[in-house]
């Protein structure tokens, strides 16, 4: 039985050229997290954090994705094309798979502020 919930940073905005932290948190379960996969809106993988082998940044993103904090991901040098959905997939034992969603809007405006608040999607 899957008792856990994924909390995410929800809908966030950030400035073009800036950086943003994508963060998910799994709570209300004692399940062991074996791996966390981070995917972009087109389902391409950005990064994997394996519990035993550590972080693995995909080649296409190696110059502008930084691991962390924690199981989160920092996306740097943002472009307008980065606007869209991001998904964290928690592979756990024995529960199975949990998935969280974040929507990132990259803004041209210099007054755009990075807003981040945890919410349950």
């Amino acid at each position: 039985m899957m008792t856990g919930t994924i909390e995410t940073t929800g809908n966030i905005s950030a400035k073009k050229g800036g950086s943003v932290i994508l963060q998910c948190h799994l709570s209300s379960t004692m399940a062991q997290v074996t791996q966390v996969n981070w995917e972009q809106h087109d389902h391409s993988l950005l990064a994997i954090r394996n519990a035993e082998l550590g972080w693995h940044i995909y080649p296409a993103f190696k110059d502008r994705v930084a691991p962390g904090p924690g199981l989160g991901l920092t996306l740097q040098s943002l472009t307008m094309n980065d606007t869209g959905e991001y998904f964290c997939t928690y592979h756990t034992y024995p529960d199975g798979t949990y998935r969280g969603r974040i929507f990132l809007e990259v803004l041209e405006s210099s007054v755009a502020e990075h807003s981040a608040r945890f919410q349950i999607p």
Epitope: T34, Q35, L45, I48, N50, E52, L53, G54, H56, I57, Y58, P59, A60, K62, H91, Y93
Partner: antibody, heavy 123, light 109 residues
Framework: QVQLQESGPGLVKPSQTLSLTCTVS??????????WGWIRQPPGKGLEWIGS???????YYNPSLKSRVTISVDTSKNQFSLKLSSVTAADTAVYYC???????????????WGQGTMVTVSS | EIVLTQSPGTLSLSPGERATLSCRAS???????LAWYQQKPGQAPRLLIY???SRATGIPDRFSGSGSGTDFTLTISRLEPEDFAVYYC??????????FGGGTKVEIK
């Protein structure tokens, strides 16, 4: 489709270093989800995993061989290599390279293999 | 390390018969991490089954895998002449390290 090809000397003297290279064709070693591994098989015996490497250089090794093993990657040549130091006759085996799906979780396996290369350790 | 014990060591059967191969682990293995391979003389191993029960691409449906915990089974429902080979199970954990079983030879009776 992805193919792997081992290359290197077929004869190595005791106490020397065994060096092999695996060339990946039909796909990029920077595929992202895969590690790339080495497995060996002494004549008439079973399979023994040696170690595996990610395109970024991250590795994991068989603890029983770790002190003698170095696996490296050259993404510009789409190759990865094995070095095994201080070899003895017990290291005589067919050496295979293979694609390692350790990060695929429910598909963890070696799904593509090279044809293998026989390495004999003898003076 | 996790020791995988395969039995029997040799299985003598005729074409058309059913083959049942066993792989027993010294400690529990996630079924997601258990694979089976076929190896013919002078050839590299070929992946048959991953995740204990999923057939790899191009593998005929006469091959099936099952099991969980410490006991896993590879079944060949009706042996074809090309199925006579050595079969290895493998567990793909990182710590303890991944290991292969000692193999089961399926030979023509």
């Amino acid at each position: 489709q992805v193919q792997l090809q081992e290359s290197g000397p077929g004869l190595v003297k005791p106490s020397q270093t065994l060096s092999l290279t695996c060339t990946v064709s039909g796909g990029s070693i920077e595929s992202g989800v895969y590690y790339w591994g080495w497995i060996r098989q002494p004549p008439g015996k079973g399979l023994e995993w040696i170690g595996s490497i990610y395109y970024s250089g991250s590795t994991y090794y068989n603890p029983s061989l770790k002190s003698r093993v170095t696996i490296s990657v050259d993404t510009s040549k789409n190759q990865f290599s094995l070095k095994l130091s201080s070899v003895t006759a017990a290291d005589t085996a067919v050496y295979y390279c293979a694609r390692d799906g350790v990060l695929t979780l429910n598909k963890r396996s070696f799904d593509i293999w090279g044809q293998g290369t026989m390495v004999t350790v003898s003076s | 390390e996790i020791v995988l014990t395969q039995s029997p060591g040799t299985l003598s059967l005729s074409p058309g018969e059913r083959a049942t191969l066993s792989c027993r682990a010294s400690q529990s293995v996630s079924s997601s991490y258990l694979a089976w391979y076929q190896q013919k003389p002078g050839q590299a191993p070929r992946l048959l089954i991953y995740g204990a029960s999923s057939r790899a691409t191009g593998i005929p449906d006469r091959f099936s895998g099952s099991g969980s915990g410490t006991d896993f089974t590879l079944t060949i429902s009706r042996l074809e002449p090309e199925d006579f080979a050595v079969y290895y199970c493998q567990q793909h954990t990182v710590r303890p390290p991944l290991t292969f079983g000692g193999g089961t030879k399926v030979e023509i009776k």
